[in-house]
Amino acid sequence: TLNSVLNSNAIKNLPPPLGGAAGHPGSAVSAAPGILYPGGNKYQTIDNYQPYPCAEDEECGTDEYCASPTRGGDAGVQICLACRKRRKRCMRHAMCCPGNYCKNGICVSSDQNNFRGEIEETITESFGNDHSTLDGYSRRTTLSSKMYHSKGQEGSVCLRSSDCATGLCCARHFWSKICKPVLKEGQVCTKHRRKGSHGLEIFQRCYCGEGLSCRIQKDHHQASNSSRLHTCQRH
């Protein structure tokens, strides 16, 4: 299971963010940690595939995008659909499978040098990256290093974790993605346990670092299993 959490990796002792509400189709939820939005199977491998409702591409898995299941169908009913392979029709990058991007309505290989220009300017100037992953696994092929100057530092906007410098991952922050530190041993992490219980989140921590996994903290006894504290621990 991949790890993420509502709170930003950087938000440790701050009170819940105030003054902002995330508007979801048909709902109004406060932008406070602890609230999960409906939908999505973005964090788990699905053994028996079921269509998951979604509102954004990033609520879906690495090889999926969010759209209406029927051509010209009701825009309010969207599910995670399988990504489109090379030479298939597309409307945006997220529709194309990893290693490809959408150019002139067709999925083409992102290995080509012109992909850099297609994403616009530099990676650090991009922002509403609704189609990028919430984890360390790259949704889109890493861009050739000659195409842009440097890896994103902490606080830089990113498309995927490979855009960030070593020790950082690309994690959701409000309506964007920014480079945040990969979690160290003993730091709090979140493990999503149930399918469909982990919709689009406002904040997100990175995954645990190399050699670590997100497990229930020993000696942390609480009444409810679901509220037990998870931390990054050695394998």
């Epitope: 963010p17 945006r92 922002f127």
Partner: antibody
Amino acid sequence: QVQLVESGGGLVQPGGSLRLSCAASGFTFNNYGMTWVRQAPGKGLEWVSGISGSGSYTYYADSVKGRFTISRDNSKNTLYLQMNSLRAEDTAVYYCARTIYMDYWGQGTLVTVSS
Amino acid sequence: DIVLTQSPATLSLSPGERATLSCRASQNLFSPYLAWYQQKPGQAPRLLIYGASNRATGVPARFSGSGSGTDFTLTISSLEPEDFAVYYCQQYMTLPLTFGQGTKVEIN
């Protein structure tokens, strides 16, 4: 090159409505979230609202929540701000911008709320 | 809300001089989620720095950002005539996104 052009500003009476538009070009619009920021005459900058790339998720400052609605039409590469129940204190130049640390800005459109 | 306080309100300097602008947050930002903008009269703001210390595309090397926690600084190593403007800091740590009240850098 990236261009953002706002329109729709003007003079409106308190309690009235206006709809601002921001036409975007030079980048793949639906890949990017967008933001509205305003600046009252002679004052500083104030964040108003933000919207994700697909338009499914929106965020508002407390001062405008319930009165303003941000939206976008990705087929037209256009961002909108519907402003209802306008107050004198909403008088400002309204800018649309791209990114959470706004890397591109429009030239702004002036909204004047006065009787 | 996180309040950003910029100081000084006005900085009177001559071309070639070094300008140091301060931005203090009312709460620890924990991470470098801070940006700096330049605004000239009648114009939209322009992004200079993001992530506290990263220069935006096309911004001259004389502009640099530093700081962490609650104290952040924008430094202009040697003022050029076109640098006289108002400078704003902005945090994107938490909602609402907030800006400082601005520092005006004027010609002495």
